[in-house]
């Protein structure tokens, strides 16, 4: 572990209430193929414990979705990954809209610091699939 | 190699017969920019040779495709990446539907064990492009 | 640095003139969360300074975009990442069309050599968003 290979892959636990756009994550071998090796979960949000550059990746699939269901909503369904705390470091890192699709998937490299908590905000009225092969979120430390 | 940096990037060789949804892959410098350094191919399927956590990534583009061609089919075209053998470890790791798009691309971290064979199943009537910049599949060992 | 952990994450600076499909990138802490650690920029194009296998990733979001705007154009908007110089090594590495979506995102492993310059060509009449959480391009050295 001293090599700094912090890594996590999480599965969806649940969505927050109507006024909370955050997705709540869970991880651990007992749950399937998710795991936390270094980072930790704080009330379903991922907290970084080691400074460095990380590869952040996410895939979210909407449940009961068709091209029409994503396009007919007035407010497009959007997924944003960002640092939500500490407030002084709050920033959006990655943002995608579903438009006429039912899945978004992306990844990026970004510097993260110990204590950064990442939030994944899903705005819109559609809920995500909890199938572990359709919705997941992970980070991988890649260098100091 | 003893560092355990197993890595592979494959290009599409061919699709299977009608009742076999698997894509068959190939790799090697003679074929272009694909390669296998550690993992191996068994009848076009990727077999892992070292335990660890891997980043698995894939992009598949449908040939002769337009938004209408993906949306007008009764059964949506879907791509699933999973462990298909040994049977005791069979599981779907990554799944995406094309909906009104012609390309899917995603990635995830997952634990894999020596002997795991990964299959990429494309269900539906549309065929994938074999252009090496449009359809590819790879794994990268990232930590024990 | 001697470990060879070359890495870069870039944000969009600007698009080229009409007859130049290339996107022009910029990076550095003063600009936000982009950075160059090893690779360098040459007139907005990313140049590799160390041989190896790299993970190349990109996300491009079209500005002022809706499903209809991407689908109603005769020539679909396409993004291609390739080696554009030296000419002897020119090749397309990664290609995606937007079809009815407004964002493309993908990644792949590919061998790159010192001196390779990567170009990201966006063809079509739609322009990309310069929001740093919507459009970005990066590479990560992963092994010799």
């Amino acid at each position: 572990e001293s090599l700094g290979w912090d890594i996590a892959e999480l599965q969806l636990n649940h969505t927050g209430p109507q006024q909370d756009p955050r997705l709540y994550w869970q991880g651990g071998p007992a749950l399937g193929r998710s795991f936390l090796r270094g980072p930790e979960l704080d009330k379903g949000q991922l907290r970084i414990r080691r400074d460095g550059i990380y590869m952040v990746h996410i895939q979210v699939t909407l449940a009961i979705c068709s091209s029409t269901s994503t396009s007919r909503h007035h407010h497009p369904t959007t997924l944003a990954v960002g640092i939500c705390s500490p407030a002084s470091r709050s920033i959006s890192l990655l943002r995608l809209s579903f438009h006429q699709g039912c899945t978004i998937a992306s990844q990026r490299l970004t510097p993260l610091a110990r204590g950064d908590t990442l939030c994944t905000n899903l705005t819109g009225t559609l809920l995500p699939s909890r199938n572990t092969d359709e919705t997941f979120f992970g980070v991988q430390w890649v260098r100091p | 190699e003893s560092l355990g940096w197993d890595i592979a990037e494959l290009q599409l060789n061919h699709t299977g017969p009608q009742q076999d949804p698997r894509l068959y892959w190939q790799g090697g410098p003679a074929l272009g920019r694909s390669f296998l350094r550690g993992p191996e191919l068994d009848k076009g399927q990727l077999r892992i040779r070292r335990d660890g956590i891997y980043m698995v990534h894939i992009q598949v583009t449908l040939a002769i495709c337009s938004s209408t061609s993906t949306s007008r089919h009764h059964h949506p075209t879907t791509l699933a990446v999973g462990i298909c053998s040994p049977a005791s470890r069979s599981i779907s790791l990554l799944r995406l539907s094309f909906h009104q798009g012609c390309t899917i691309a995603s990635q995830r971290l997952t634990p894999l064990a020596r002997g795991d064979t990964l299959c990429t199943n494309l269900t539906g009537t549309l065929l994938p492009s074999r252009n090496t910049d449009e359809t590819f599949f790879g794994v990268q060992w990232v930590r024990p | 640095e001697s470990l060879g952990w070359d890495i870069a994450e870039l944000q969009l600076n600007h698009t080229g003139p009409q007859q130049d499909p290339r996107l022009y990138w910029q990076g550095g802490p003063a600009l936000g969360r982009s950075f160059l650690r090893g690779p360098e920029l040459d007139k907005g194009q990313l140049r590799i300074r160390r041989d190896g296998i790299y993970m190349v990733h990109i996300q491009v979001t079209l500005a002022i975009c809706s499903s209809t705007s991407t689908s109603r154009h005769h020539h679909p908007t396409t993004l291609a990442v390739g080696i554009c110089s030296p000419a002897s090594r020119s090749i397309s590495l990664l290609r995606l069309s937007f079809h009815q979506g407004c964002t493309i995102a993908s990644q792949r492993l590919t061998p790159l050599a010192r001196g390779d310059t990567l170009c990201t060509n966006l063809t079509g009449t739609l322009l990309p968003s310069r929001n740093t959480d919507e459009t970005f391009f990066g590479v990560q050295w992963v092994r010799p």
């Epitope: 649940h14 969505t15 927050g16 209430p17 109507q18 006024q19 709540y24 449940a63 009961i64 269901s69 009225t125 559609l126 809920l127 699939s129 909890r130 199938n131 | - | -």
Partner: antibody
Framework: EIQLVQSGPELKKPGETVKISCKAS????????MNWVKQAPGQGLKWMGW????????TYADDFTGRFAFSLETSASTAYLQINNLKNEDMAAYFC????????????WGQGTTLTVSS | DIQMIQSTSSLSASLGNRVTISCRAS??????LNWYQQKPDGTVKLLIY???RLHAGVPSRFSGSGSGTDYSLTISNLEQEDIATYFC?????????FGAGTKLEIK
């Protein structure tokens, strides 16, 4: 203890207006949206929509646009349902309901307000 | 809109019996299915959410199961206080929709 306490039964004539209140206690009112549910006599439950208690933005189900209005008195931790130009088919019990941790799962319900519409 | 069908409007059972109430959705709702109990006095309580998760304080004789479009609520050992009407609700997308209810009576 979290509670949603609704105003008492109402007897109204067709064409009149009614305003039903739902007073919340035991939590920070602006942290959770307030939903409204209708139950006609002998019928099932029908979701009417919800109001964002932080922004005040209402969302109405298709059958409840026009004559129906959700509003707030944040300082009193109270949500309101107003129905204008009452019709016979508005005769029902109306419930306010609130989520806890999970989207669209209603952990807390008001006791209901019975509205009778009769000429 | 997603329709929620509770085909049995009323059900009679003896105390101590095992009772199962079913609910069908007009399309796959990915286990976003909740059950509520409405007592004769009109009070409504959450029993089960996400198909099978028991809400805090609800007796363990209540359980839920199902997937896709078909779901059920089971009371393993019927008690007098369980006499009520039970509603299913899909919580996967707006507008939220409920079943018509199943009224449980003592035989």
């Amino acid at each position: 203890e979290i509670q949603l306490v609704q105003s008492g039964p109402e007897l109204k004539k067709p064409g009149e207006t009614v305003k039903i209140s739902c007073k919340a206690s035991g939590y920070t009112f602006t942290n959770y949206g307030m939903n409204w549910v209708k139950q006609a006599p002998g019928q099932g439950l029908k979701w009417m929509g919800w109001i964002n208690t932080y922004t005040g933005e209402p969302t109405y189900a298709d059958d409840f646009t026009g004559r129906f209005a959700f509003s707030l008195e944040t300082s009193a931790s109270t949500a309101y349902l107003q129905i204008n130009n009452l019709k016979n088919e508005d005769m029902a019990a109306y419930f306010c309901a609130r989520e806890e941790d999970y989207r669209y799962v209603f952990n807390y319900w008001g006791q209901g307000t019975t509205l009778t519409v009769s000429s | 809109d997603i329709q929620m069908i509770q085909s049995t409007s009323s059900l009679s059972a003896s105390l101590g019996n095992r009772v199962t109430i079913s609910c069908r959705a007009s399309q796959d709702i990915s286990n976003y299915l909740n059950w509520y109990q409405q007592k004769p006095d009109g009070t409504v309580k959450l029993l089960i959410y996400d198909t099978s998760r028991l809400h805090a304080g609800v007796p363990s004789r209540f359980s839920g199961s199902g997937s896709g479009t078909d779901y059920s609520l089971t009371i393993s050992n019927l008690e007098q206080e369980d006499i009520a009407t039970y509603f299913c609700q899909q919580g996967v997308t707006l507008p939220l929709t409920f079943g018509a209810g199943t009224k449980l009576e003592i035989k």
